[in-house]
Interface confidence: low
């Protein structure tokens, strides 16, 4: 058993038929010595007496609120939640898998820049009872400071029969150098609470391999004269690392017609600008990517070519 | 020439040497996302190589202040790089195919370190720590796990030279 | 290794006056130098850089009233049209946020008509 | 431009004591700040650079602490030659700012 928050504790339990489970004492916070009764959740009946309550939890029907009680006042309460282990395996119940970039990924990050600061997400069809509380470091064995928010709702989704919520955080890194080549791994631990299941979820990474730019902006197309060729310009999004001359992009630039089937043409530029031959009805899209280290491409930037 | 008396280095064409290391790192190991090689065991065999940290001046203010700093812990990375490459970890068994880009990687890293640091002048290398593996299979992890490594650390110096080619070459 | 300023004096307002910054025993392409600037009796107050490629950057508040411009073993401050308000002690140094920083000993300005 | 709030503007301490200053940058400065002390008619001299390194030939009663965007330079054991102003200075790659200083008086 260990101690998650103030008067909240979390007892592991190997998960199987006929598990012994784990002997829990509970001790009332109180000076008082004599008199005291025990309750579980909004429970009338008293589950024990005395300043102390041994109790063996094998299910979820022996986790729950215990509260200790002398003449009518409550003393102290204890919430105990069970962390279940299956196989040698801790349940991953509350999360769905994303099962992206592979099996087994239930958070999933991204960075836009190189400045410490990234967005971490996760999936659930749990609609209540549900709370995340994230914590982030750089390293675990002396690990500096991430500074994370508070995990909020940030997507419904309808999924055949199933509505699928979507859960994001902010993080940022305190001491954040983003010159420097990563040697110690970002960990984010998200601690998550369904009713009276306790779950933990981790990632780690480096930010570098997470970084997605934001598409180009002022996408912009130039005709040239007699000529069926555009001069395609475009910027740095404003939210990539500066100054560019030092966070450098590449960038893809796609002639798409209008029916997926038609061959796109690809022109790969470290420039910001390309010149490109407009074909009728098609359009034309961008996007960056980091020029020294092969992270995700940013979504497209497009314009018609009308 | 980044020479350690403090003359700059020939930042263009250093720009264009480690530009093309980034492309090489990355054609010899493309595979990212495919294996998170920070699960596999064995942590001891890349911990030990020389990363440019936040203190070495390779920020663009650091580099503005005195580029030396930063150049020297370069450089010290590239011998490190080029030694591993050109070590049995790379040269023993599974043999490398032969038009594998490992070979041009390791020439562009000597190719490199020289044009930082010129017959003659001698900045002080890190020792390259004794690495041989007995299994196949234990070489080819670290060959993954030094090639992520590298990718990482030659994209701070392309970050690095392409910054200093465009605001501090003369 | 060291930095001295010189060419502080009294000037009259509006008559444009030039600081020079000398070093000697490192190279001025390996650093950057920064001028600082101290009134009478008042705290410290940044000018402005000139870095390793010879950009000058300046704090908003010195744009268009000061130039910063480097030689092979100098670094020239002009004060273009000076006020009575940038009387004071003018420093220069290397390296601000480095280990091996050097500061001159400043040069006293003094602007009076 | 980064603006570098310093405080306290004046402070006093026994010999044996601590002081602490604090700067709180106007936005990320990451570790590029230095700490300077400067005595009446002396050049300013240097004591911490990049947030915590102790410049060379400073006593390591100077500690220089960072966190987020507030960095705090403690004197643990203040001795008399510790009276003096004290200023931080802060940049963002390009732009630099000091703080308003910190009279520190010894008593």
């Known amino acids: 058993i260990w101690e998650l928050k103030k008067d909240v504790y979390v007892v592991e339990l190997d998960w199987y038929p006929d598990a012994p489970g784990e002997m829990v004492v509970l001790t009332c916070d109180t000076p008082e010595e004599d008199g005291i009764t025990w309750t579980l959740d909004q429970s009338s009946e008293v589950l024990g007496s005395g300043k102390t309550l041994t109790i063996q939890v094998k299910e979820f029907g022996d986790a729950g609120q215990y509260t200790c009680h002398k003449g009518g006042e409550v003393l102290s309460h204890s919430l105990l939640l069970l962390h279940k282990k299956e196989d040698g395996i801790w349940s991953t119940d509350i999360l769905k898998d994303q099962k992206e970039p592979k099996n087994k990924t239930f958070l999933r990050c991204e960075a836009k820049n190189y400045s410490g600061r990234f967005t971490c997400w996760w999936l659930t069809t749990i609609s209540t009872d549900l709370t995340f509380s994230v914590k982030s470091s750089r390293g675990s064995s002396d690990p500096q400071g991430v500074t994370c928010g508070a995990a909020t709702l940030s997507a419904e989704r309808v999924r055949g029969d199933n509505k699928e919520y979507e859960y994001s955080v902010e993080c940022q890194e305190d001491s954040a150098c983003p010159a420097a080549e990563e040697s110690l791994p970002i960990e984010v631990m998200v601690d998550a609470v369904h009713k009276l299941k306790y779950e933990n979820y981790t990632s780690s990474f480096f930010i570098r391999d997470i970084i997605k730019p934001d598409p180009p902006k002022n996408l912009q197309l130039k005709p040239l004269k007699n000529s069926r060729q555009v001069e395609v310009s475009w910027e740095y999004p404003d939210t990539w690392s500066t100054p560019h001359s030092y966070f450098s992009l590449t960038f893809c630039v796609q002639v798409q017609g209008k029916s997926k089937r038609e061959k796109k043409d690809r022109v790969f530029t470290d420039k910001t600008s390309a010149t490109v031959i407009c074909r009728k009805n098609a359009s034309i899209s961008v996007r960056a990517q980091d020029r020294y280290y092969s992270s995700s491409w940013s979504e497209w930037a497009s314009v018609p070519c009308s | 020439r980044a020479v350690p008396g403090g003359s700059s280095p020939a930042w263009t064409q250093c720009q264009q040497l480690s530009q093309k290391l980034c492309t090489l790192a990355w054609s010899a190991h493309p595979l990212v996302g495919h294996m998170d090689l920070r699960e596999e065991g064995d942590e001891e065999t890349t911990n030990d190589v020389p990363h440019i940290q936040c203190g070495d001046g390779c920020d663009p203010q650091g580099l503005r202040d005195n580029s030396q700093f930063c150049l020297q812990r370069i450089h010290q990375g590239l011998i490190f790089y080029e030694k591993l490459l050109g070590s049995d970890i790379f040269t023993g068994e599974p043999s490398l195919l032969p038009d594998s880009p490992v070979g041009q990687l390791h020439a562009s890293l000597l190719g490199l370190s020289q044009l930082l640091q010129p017959e003659g002048h001698h900045w002080e290398t890190q020792q390259i720590p004794s690495l041989s593996p007995s299994q196949p299979w234990q070489r080819l992890l670290l060959r993954f796990k030094i090639l992520r490594s590298l990718q990482a650390f030659v994209a701070v110096a392309a970050r690095v030279f392409a910054h200093g080619a465009a605001t501090l070459s003369p | 290794q060291s930095v001295e300023e010189s060419g502080g004096r009294l000037v009259t307002p509006g008559t444009p006056l030039t600081l020079t910054c000398t070093v000697s025993?490192?190279?001025?392409?390996?650093?950057?130098m920064s001028w600082v600037r101290q009134a009478p009796g008042k705290g410290l107050e940044w000018i402005g850089v000139i870095g390793l490629g010879g950009s000058a950057y300046y704090a908003s508040w010195a744009k268009g009233r000061f130039t910063i411009s480097g030689a092979s073993t100098t670094v020239d401050l002009k004060i273009t049209s000076p006020t009575t308000e940038d009387t004071a002690t003018y420093f220069c140094?290397?390296?601000?946020?480095?280990?091996?920083?050097?500061w001159g000993p400043g040069t006293l300005v003094t602007v009076s008509s | 431009d980064v603006v570098m709030t310093q405080t306290p503007s004046s402070t006093s301490a026994a010999v044996g004591g601590t002081v602490t200053i604090k700067c709180q940058a106007s936005q990320s400065i990451s570790s590029w700040l230095s700490w300077y002390q400067q005595k009446p008619g002396q050049r300013p001299k240097p004591l911490i650079v990049?947030?915590?390194t102790l410049a060379s030939g400073v006593p390591s009663r100077f500690k220089g602490n960072r966190s987020g965007t507030e960095y705090t330079l403690t004197i643990s054991g203040v001795q008399r030659e510790d009276a003096a102003a004290y200023y931080c200075l802060g940049g963002d790659g390009n732009v630099s700012n000091f703080g308003g200083g910190t009279k520190v008086v010894v008593v």
């Open positions: 140094a290397r390296a601000t946020y480095s280990d091996d920083n050097i």
């Open positions: 990049r947030a915590s």
């Open positions: 025993g490192f190279s001025l392409n390996s650093y950057s």
